[in-house]
Structures are given as structure tokens and as C-alpha cells.
């Protein structure tokens, strides 16, 4: 569940994202389908970077609504082709 | 903490290729976007080129059908194979990686094209 990641990911704080956290990430995430609002939220809450660790067609699945979750920061490190993903998904959220 | 550090900057004649190569400190990481970037003399540093944890990459239009990323994992290398050099390719050349989150530089290299 969600709670579960937030709790792990509390127990992490402050350290750098370990590779079993990393694949744990990766796998809650393949198990929802897709990366919702509220596991956008968490994630960023707690790794500001991880979007610009996605490829842009991993960007491409996220859905426009979760991008409410982000913030101008969790975009720092994104290179141009994730950006040219994210832009338009924040575009059309912000429209609805 | 994971340090990067580019190797393979020199002079290079015009029409020639050249190969740039950026050692990763650590082999652990899980989720990644690995990049080259790019500053010449008085301009903005430049995005080149990714590649993603997924296996796939992307180039900026200036270096497309020029350039060419690559990560050999085995040996902790990222490389920059550069082909069809020209002047205005001259610059401090550095690797950046996202890895697991978190963005990391490395100190650059210096490539100019000249004859």
C-alpha cells in the first residue's frame, strides 16, 4: 500500500535512495499501473529528483492530472526531451 | 557519494571523431538518467544527449546523426562518440548523471577542433 512506501520511505530519510528502495519504488509502481497523483506526491516529497530519473517514455504514462503533484524544484534536473513530455501533461492539467 | 570523471578531451581536426568517456564511482544504482552536456567560451552550458535506465536515449538537434551516448555497465563507463566534428563543437564537455534521484556532476573536459 501507499502507507507502507511512505513508512519505508521514512525510515530512509535523509539517506541517499539505496538500490532496494529503488526497486522497490520501481515495482509498487508497475503494480498501480501507473504513477498516480498521491505516488507522485510521495515520491517527490521525499526524492525531489525522481521524475528526471524517468525516460520520457516512462514521462509519457504519467497521467496530467498527477502532475498537480509536482513542483518547480522536482524539475531542476530534467534534461529538454523529459521536459518536452512534462510540459504539455502540466499544460492540460492546469486547463482542467 | 557517486563521483563522475570525464577523460579523452584534446584537439581534433575538423571532419574527424573523437570519443569522450565519463567513469561512474558506483555500479548500484537502479534508476538513472545518464547525460553529456556541453560549454563553449561565453555561452550557456548545452544538454547533448540521455540515456535512460530503460535503455533508451534522446539527442538535442544540433548533435543528432553526429553524436552517440552509450553506458557499458559492466565496466561503470559512460562514452560520448562524437563523428563529423566541427569548430563549433569546441567546449568543456561534462557528464551528469540522475541517478536514483539525485544529480551529479563531473569537473569536464576539454575538446577543441582545429586544424
Known amino acids: 500500500s501507499l502507507e507502507t512506501l511512505k513508512a519505508l520511505l521514512e525510515v530512509n530519510k535523509g539517506h541517499e535512495m539505496s538500490p532496494q528502495v529503488a526497486t522497490l519504488i520501481d515495482r509498487f509502481v508497475k503494480g498501480r499501473g501507473q504513477l498516480d497523483k498521491d505516488t507522485l506526491d510521495t515520491l517527490t516529497a521525499f526524492y525531489p529528483g525522481y521524475l528526471c530519473s524517468l525516460s520520457p517514455e516512462e514521462l509519457s504514462s504519467v497521467p496530467p492530472s498527477s502532475i498537480w503533484a509536482v513542483r518547480p524544484q522536482d524539475l531542476d534536473t530534467c534534461d529538454p526531451r523529459q521536459l518536452d513530455v512534462l510540459y504539455p501533461k502540466a499544460r492540460l492539467a492546469f486547463q482542467n | 557519494q557517486l563521483q563522475l570523471v570525464e577523460s579523452g578531451g584534446g584537439l581534433v581536426q575538423p571532419g574527424g571523431s573523437h570519443r569522450l568517456s565519463c567513469a561512474v564511482s558506483?555500479?548500484?544504482?537502479?534508476?538513472?538518467?545518464m547525460r553529456w552536456y556541453r560549454q563553449a567560451p561565453g555561452k550557456e552550458r548545452e544538454w547533448l544527449t540521455s540515456i535512460y535506465s530503460d535503455g533508451s536515449s534522446a539527442y538535442a538537434d544540433s548533435v543528432k546523426d553526429r553524436f552517440t551516448i552509450s553506458l557499458d555497465n559492466a565496466k561503470n563507463m559512460l562514452y560520448l562518440q562524437m563523428n563529423s566534428l566541427k569548430p563549433e563543437d569546441t567546449a568543456v564537455y561534462y557528464c551528469n548523471a540522475n541517478v536514483d534521484s539525485k544529480a551529479y556532476w563531473g569537473q569536464g573536459t576539454q575538446v577543441t577542433v582545429a586544424s
Open positions: 558506483v555500479s548500484t544504482f537502479t534508476r538513472y538518467a
